[in-house]
Interface confidence: low
């Protein structure tokens, strides 16, 4: 069983909000990790979207629109990526990753968990 699990595909209508889920295996505690989200469009490498540890400890990638936001459900051991006002260019692969929370937050190298699995979020014209 992989350390991280994401559903293989999701779809939603343009203009709506979609929430992608990243579930951490039960022998790990999401409460001690930052959740990182990446977007990968066809022909491009993955790009950093955001990091979420808590409401008071999070960071957005430069120029990443606020339509992209992170959250966590510690009880369910899950991280979430919400994308509001879905646009055609949001059709992409989305990757989550867990990183050890560091005291210097974004300034320090991250330690990656073993595995990252993709979620494909596909927008469709209603």
């Amino acid at each position: 069983q992989p350390v991280l699990h994401q559903p293989p595909a999701m779809s939603s209508a343009l203009g709506t909000t979609i929430r992608l889920t990243c579930t951490l295996r039960n022998d790990h505690d999401i409460g001690v990790y930052s959740v990182y989200w990446y977007q990968q469009r066809p022909g491009h490498p993955p790009r950093f979207l955001l990091r979420y540890f808590s409401q008071s400890d999070k960071s957005q990638g430069p120029q990443v629109p606020p339509r992209f936001s992170g959250s966590k459900d510690v009880a369910r051991n899950r991280g979430y990526l919400s994308i509001s006002e879905l646009q055609p260019e949001d059709e992409a692969m989305y990757y989550c990753a867990m990183g050890a929370r560091s005291s210097e937050k974004e300034e320090r190298e991250r330690e990656w968990e073993e595995e990252m699995e993709p979620t494909a979020a596909r927008t469709r014209v209603p």
Partner: antibody
């Protein structure tokens, strides 16, 4: 404050190789891609390739495929571009640039590579 | 590869002039277009991303527009520090490609 500092100018013989470094500071190195762009004297900008540091995958322009290797050392937050089988047409300023989700915002100062016999 | 064609290749203008530079892609690139400014001996500087979004710290006299294949960079009132070469770049797909550049010179 994000900074990309490149290695110094190089003079190389035709047929040899050059390795240019690009040290990043002020940000999470593994969160971004590093692109390499070159500019021959009096010419425009030409993308050579890039590497996504966190994921390790590199992508190269067809023109340079087999001659260029882009790598990154996470422990020193440094990216490298090695170009082999140098010829006179490779004389150019080589830039590294950080890909910030949309496009390259932060650029190194440039490294002049001169290929001459 | 996607070809990016910029026009004009050079232009002469005076301080205060409105300047327009166009960039055409050989195929549709949505809004995945950036504009850069480069001065002699310096690295390029990002002005516009996503075709029309102004980079942080860039004066509002710079604006971008367009989608698909046709794009425009406009300088509403040319300032002395704006004399430089401007490049468009598509990042819709690899390989990333630049336009040939437009040199803005003093008339």
């Amino acid at each position: 404050q994000v900074q990309l500092v490149q290695s110094g100018a190089e003079v190389k013989k035709p047929g040899s190789s050059v390795k240019v470094s690009c040290k990043a500071s002020g940000g999470t190195f593994t969160a971004y891609a590093i692109n390499w762009v070159r500019q021959a004297p009096g010419q425009g900008l030409e993308w050579m390739g890039g590497i996504n540091v966190g994921f390790g995958g590199a992508n190269y322009a067809q023109k340079f495929q087999g001659r260029v290797t882009i790598t990154a050392d996470k422990s020193t937050s440094t990216a490298y571009m090695e170009l082999s089988s140098l010829r006179s047409e490779d004389t150019a300023v080589y830039y590294c640039a950080r890909d910030d989700y949309w496009t390259s915002v932060y650029w190194g100062q440039g490294t002049l590579v001169t290929v001459s016999s | 590869d996607i070809q990016m064609t910029q026009s004009p290749s050079s232009l002469s203008a005076s301080v205060g002039d409105r300047v327009t530079i166009t960039c055409r892609a050989s195929q549709g690139i949505s809004n995945y277009l950036a504009w850069f400014q480069q001065k002699p001996g310096k690295a390029p500087k990002s002005l516009i991303y996503a075709a029309s979004s102004l980079q942080s710290g860039v004066p509002s006299r710079f604006s971008g527009s367009g989608s698909g294949t046709d794009f425009t960079l406009t300088i509403s009132s040319l300032q002395p520090e704006d004399f430089a070469t401007y490049y468009c770049q598509q990042y819709n797909s690899y390989p990333l490609t630049f336009g040939g550049g437009t040199k803005v010179e003093i008339k």
